[in-house]
């Protein structure tokens, strides 16, 4: 499938609009600090060049790889060294090292201002004045803050963003129409970014085999009627798509994703009965719909797994002939029978099975050795079941905010060295598992909860990797992808931690807290809670709860006061003194 000009090939396949959007996303994900206008200029230059190649594939430089073309373009940015420091050194390298260098400098937590939503009328005016610039700005702002966002999916978000403005800016009550849609896009976007970040971490930190194992398990749950060969083909194609996107090859990724959606829809009879509606949609909606499609019904008469994987005398022979294929078949067969298990649990079971075969197939009596392998699965299955049961009970008792606070205390005591903003962000997200998953029946709880927790803990891992401060976090993040959650669950209070010095400034609050949204006020309180635990890691849950209630009483009192700022100053000192006296801070 060689083309004389790769850039011309992708331009023709994708069309000008998608080509420009994807190049903008790629550039914004690499150079996250560059102003919007600079990126637009670069994208326009690349687009004009691509058009010359479409007209004549033999034209000068048209035969160059996309990495070479894009990298050369990025390296023309005048302020590269001032803005990015050592990233500028990437430009001295040749491809493919230069692209690898750019990838290594992607920042999961860039120092960018929070996106503040303007007034609805202001947004609608901007949308009507220049729709194209308005939508490009959306792509740019999301891409630079989420450097691993799944690019073809971001095109889908942009399409929905445009549709929301098109509809709501004509509505009688613009705000009532638009704001819920924007909130939904924001929340879905954050979730989508985090899910994709886990896929990229899986590929980059644990390799293609780890990603393929995850994909086999997930696709087998989703398409239990599909043959193993069909699932294997889908896994290979899906791995290529995500490898490309995670590697910054966004044009190839989007093109291949479209091909995969086309293939799935052309072969839905041998894949899943649930695809019909998805396949009637336009491309971006179709791909999104397929990615989110519900699990198909399991075939009615699936035989016991034991026959082929335990009782058969050929287990070791089959394993030895093609280890990964045999393990893949085991994973496929187990996963299609267990939509009620999380993907990570299925992968733990497959790993246990693999370890057992490695040991037993070298033993004197292999069959005798592996005969009880399925018994080893029981504790692995029960551990997440029990954990989810306990935590859903706690969530139902406390509600989301206080459940988050319980997790904040739990995780701060486990890894107190982690930065307060990271602990707050991660614990708040961990706490959302309650409202997201506890409402589900038993059969859907585990896949919902544990696979969601994998996504959230990956956020902790990528943020911690940027500035490592805890050996325990590093250990849980790097030892095993599928055992990250059990590893963090097993951590007890860090007895080696030396409590943080008391700093009154940390516990100084101002009248601005009164005008914050409920969410922002919660974050302020939760930040104080983390700091409190860091100062007093031995404080009991009851003490922390009581001090937080004092804090709530203090904020409520001062927000009702005539002279709020004076109240915060005077009563704040009293609150700190009272807490110090009670907790011995």
């Amino acid at each position: 499938d060689a083309h004389k000009s790769e850039v011309a090939h992708r331009f023709k396949d994708l069309g000008e609009e998608n080509f420009k959007a994807l190049v903008l996303i790629a550039f914004a994900q690499y150079l996250q600090q560059c102003p919007f206008e600079d990126h637009v200029k670069l994208v326009n230059e690349v687009t004009e060049f691509a058009k010359t190649c479409v007209a004549d594939e033999s034209a000068e430089n048209c035969d160059k790889s996309l990495h070479t073309l894009f990298g050369d373009k990025l390296c023309t940015v005048a302020t590269l060294r001032e803005t990015y420091g050592e990233m500028a050194d990437c430009c001295a390298k040749q491809e493919p090292e230069r692209n690898e260098c750019f990838l290594q400098h992607k920042d999961d937590n860039p120092n960018l201002p929070r996106l503040v939503r303007p007034e609805v009328d202001v947004m609608c005016t901007a949308f009507h004045d220049n729709e194209e610039t308005f939508l490009k700005k959306y792509l740019y702002e999301i891409a630079r803050r989420h450097p691993y966002f799944y690019a073809p999916e971001l095109l889908f978000f942009a399409k929905r963003y445009k549709a929301a403005f098109t509809e709501c800016c004509q509505a009688a009550d613009k705000a009532a129409c638009l704001l819920p849609k924007l909130d939904e896009l924001r929340d879905e976007g954050k979730a989508s970014s985090a899910k994709q970040r886990l896929k990229c971490a899986s590929l980059q930190k644990f390799g293609e085999r780890a990603f393929k194992a995850w994909a086999v398990a997930r696709l087998s749950q989703r398409f239990p009627k599909a043959e193993f060969a069909e699932v294997s083909k889908l896994v290979t194609d899906l791995t290529k798509v995500h490898t490309e996107c995670c590697h910054g090859d966004l044009l190839e990724c989007a093109d291949d994703r479209a091909d995969l959606a086309k293939y799935i829809c052309e072969n839905q009879d041998s894949i899943s009965s649930k695809l019909k509606e998805c396949c009637e949609k336009p491309l971006l909606e179709k791909s999104h719909c397929i990615a989110e499609v519900e699990n198909d019904e399991m075939p009615a008469d699936l035989p016991s797994l034991a026959a082929d994987f335990v009782e058969s005398k050929d287990v070791c022979k089959n394993y030895a002939e093609a280890k990964d294929v045999f393990l893949g078949m085991f994973l496929y067969e187990y996963a299609r029978r267990h939509p009620d298990y999380s993907v990570v649990l299925l992968l733990r079971l497959a790993k246990t099975y693999e370890t057992t075969l490695e040991k037993c197939c070298a033993a004197a009596d292999p069959h005798e050795c592996y005969a009880k392998v399925f018994d080893e699965f029981k504790p692995l299955v029960e551990e997440p079941q029990n954990l989810i049961k306990q935590n859903c009970e706690l969530f139902e008792q406390l509600g989301e905010y206080k459940f988050q606070n319980a997790l904040l205390v739990r995780y701060t005591k486990k890894v107190p060295q982690v930065s307060t903003p990271t602990l707050v962000e991660v614990s708040r997200n961990l706490g959302k598992v309650g409202s997201k998953c506890c409402k589900h029946p038993e059969a859907k709880r585990m896949p919902c909860a544990e696979d969601y927790l994998s996504v959230v803990l990956n956020q902790l891992c990528v943020l911690h990797e940027k500035t490592p401060v805890s050996d325990r976090v590093t250990k849980c993040c790097t030892e095993s992808l599928v055992n990250r959650r059990p590893c963090f669950s097993a951590l007890e209070v860090d007895e080696t931690y030396v409590p943080k010095e008391f700093n009154a400034e940390t516990f100084t609050f101002h009248a601005d807290i009164c005008t914050l949204s409920e969410k922002e006020r919660q974050i302020k309180k939760q930040t104080a809670l983390v700091e409190l635990v860091k100062h007093k890691p031995k404080a009991t849950k009851e003490q922390l709860k009581a001090v937080m209630d004092d804090f709530a009483a203090f904020v409520e009192k001062c927000c009702k006061a005539d002279d709020k700022e004076t109240c915060f100053a005077e009563e704040g000192k009293k609150l700190v003194a009272a807490s110090q006296a009670a907790l011995g801070l």
Partner: nanobody
Amino acid sequence: QVQLVESGGGLVQAGDSLRLSCAASGRTFSGYAMGWFRQAPGKEREFVARINWSGTLTYYADSVKGRFTGSRDNAKNTVYLQMNSLKPEDTAVYYCAQRGDSGSNYDPSGYSYWGQGTQVTVSS
């Protein structure tokens, strides 16, 4: 379950003092803030004072600030309200309450357990 029993109310002259007590039994006492509320005939129940879990921080309604003092003795599971310079408008049934797990610190709905109340009458 928590039982709260108030005592110390009575009939006094304007300008006099009274000391109310509230003895608690049942649920852990020391981990929760305690509140004093009052209800005059035909009026809503209103906040008087909040004494925090350790007795180190007390908030008062503007109408009683400087005259009333709340305190607690966690060893005795008891909370107190010292009322000085009493006025006829302080006449009400006084209730002590244990803080709940949510809601406002200054509203009866934020408190889970209540005593039966003790009458305070201030004559002019």
